[in-house]
């Protein structure tokens, strides 16, 4: 069964700046990745970025830089300042759509310690 992992890290240089990394552990080819915060995209979450392998990347504030790391993983840097900036207990979710298997999603938040956290 495919799985999605989510890692949330606060940047040491900018304490209110976050990096979210997500990956897909499965055999299908990824068609679309949606990153949201405040919950899953279909359950009240707000979309931060949508990454398509052919048609490019769309992102919305406070997302600063979304990119593909590999064919099955992505990263997203969030701007740290402003009214819409995330806080330490914000939940981030990643949804990977794979054709024709379907979609898998997982959420994660900043771990209690300052060490990078892994959540599946």
């Amino acid at each position: 069964t495919p799985e999605v992992w989510v890692q949330v890290r606060m940047e040491a240089t900018e304490l209110s700046s976050f990096t979210i990394r997500c990956g897909f552990l499965g055999s299908g080819s990824i068609s679309l990745v949606t990153v949201s915060w405040g919950g899953p995209n279909g359950a009240g979450g707000t979309t931060l970025a949508v990454l398509h392998p052919e048609r490019g990347i769309r992102q919305w504030a406070p997302a600063r830089q979304a990119r593909w790391e590999t064919q099955s993983s992505i990263s997203l840097i969030l701007e740290g300042s402003g009214a819409s900036s995330p806080c330490a207990n914000t939940t981030f979710c990643c949804k990977f759509a794979s054709f024709p298997e379907g979609s898998w999603e997982a959420c994660g938040s900043l771990p209690p310690s300052s060490d990078p956290g892994l959540s599946a």
Epitope: S29, N41, G42, E54, R55, A97, P100, G102, S103
Partner: antibody, heavy 120, light 107 residues
Framework: EVQLVESGGGLVKPGGSLRLSCAAS????????MSWVRQAPGKGLELVSA????????YYPDTVKGRFTISRDDAENSLYLQMNSLRAEDTAVYYC?????????????WGQGTLVTVSS | EIVMTQSPPTLSLSPGERVTLSCKAS??????VAWYQEKPGQAPRLLIY???HRFTGIPARFSGSGSGTDFTLTISSLQPEDFAVYYC?????????FGQGTKLEIK
């Protein structure tokens, strides 16, 4: 304008074979996942085959697995469905459809359908 | 397999009426739900994708809502051309499945 035009339907005896074709135009065919959906007389819609845009991934329900084969020719902008060992219950209108990644794989374009009748 | 159950199977209504069609999934399908309209002799037509997004050219009287397992398609004021069969569809998990359809007929 997006257009999908099916052909190849007709009357065939049980155990026989047919090859359906779908000619696509008005969009970059190679960038889209494609499917065949059928509707038997008086019944609902059933997805009978799907193929990813790169052609590497395919899907078949148990009802047709081992008998139907989906393929695509991006150079010809065409989708195919090879149907072997046909049964009476395969009688239906067969539609070619296009999936839109950004719409959660919803099928945003359909052909007009081609009728397949399996009868002795 | 995720089963999509539509209700009711048939509805008899008059033009101008408001109608709500129901679709229940046997397990959560996130927001990967679409609605299609089918008329006799015509190909299905996409109305709604991602639960609530109207497809290009679809009139504002059509709206979708729901989350998780319960979804609805609402037509605010039925027009003569709206009498057709409506299908919900999930593309969240393979095998992708359709509901059995709800037929809207003129009273």
């Amino acid at each position: 304008e997006v257009q999908l035009v099916e052909s190849g339907g007709g009357l065939v005896k049980p155990g026989g074979s047919l090859r359906l074709s779908c000619a696509a135009s008005g969009f970059t065919f190679s960038s889209y996942h494609m499917s065949w959906v059928r509707q038997a007389p008086g019944k609902g819609l059933e997805l009978v085959s799907a193929i990813s845009r790169d052609g590497d991934s395919t899907y078949y329900p148990d009802t047709v697995k081992g008998r139907f084969t989906i393929s695509r020719d991006d150079a010809e902008n065409s989708l195919y469905l090879q149907m072997n060992s046909l049964r009476a219950e395969d009688t239906a209108v067969y539609y070619c459809s296009r999936h839109e990644d950004y719409f959660g794989f919803a099928m945003d374009s359909w052909g007009q359908g081609t009728l397949v009748t399996v009868s002795s | 397999e995720i089963v999509m159950t539509q209700s009711p199977p048939t509805l008899s209504l008059s033009p101008g009426e408001r109608v709500t069609l129901s679709c229940k999934a046997s397990q959560s399908v996130s927001n990967d739900v679409a609605w299609y309209q089918e008329k006799p002799g015509q190909a299905p037509r996409l109305l709604i994708y991602y639960v609530s997004h109207r497809f290009t050219g679809i009139p504002a009287r059509f709206s979708g809502s729901g989350s998780g397992t319960d979804f609805t398609l609402t037509i605010s004021s039925l027009q003569p051309e709206d009498f057709a069969v409506y299908y919900c569809h999930q593309a969240y998990r393979s095998p992708w499945t359709f509901g059995q359809g709800t037929k809207l007929e003129i009273k």
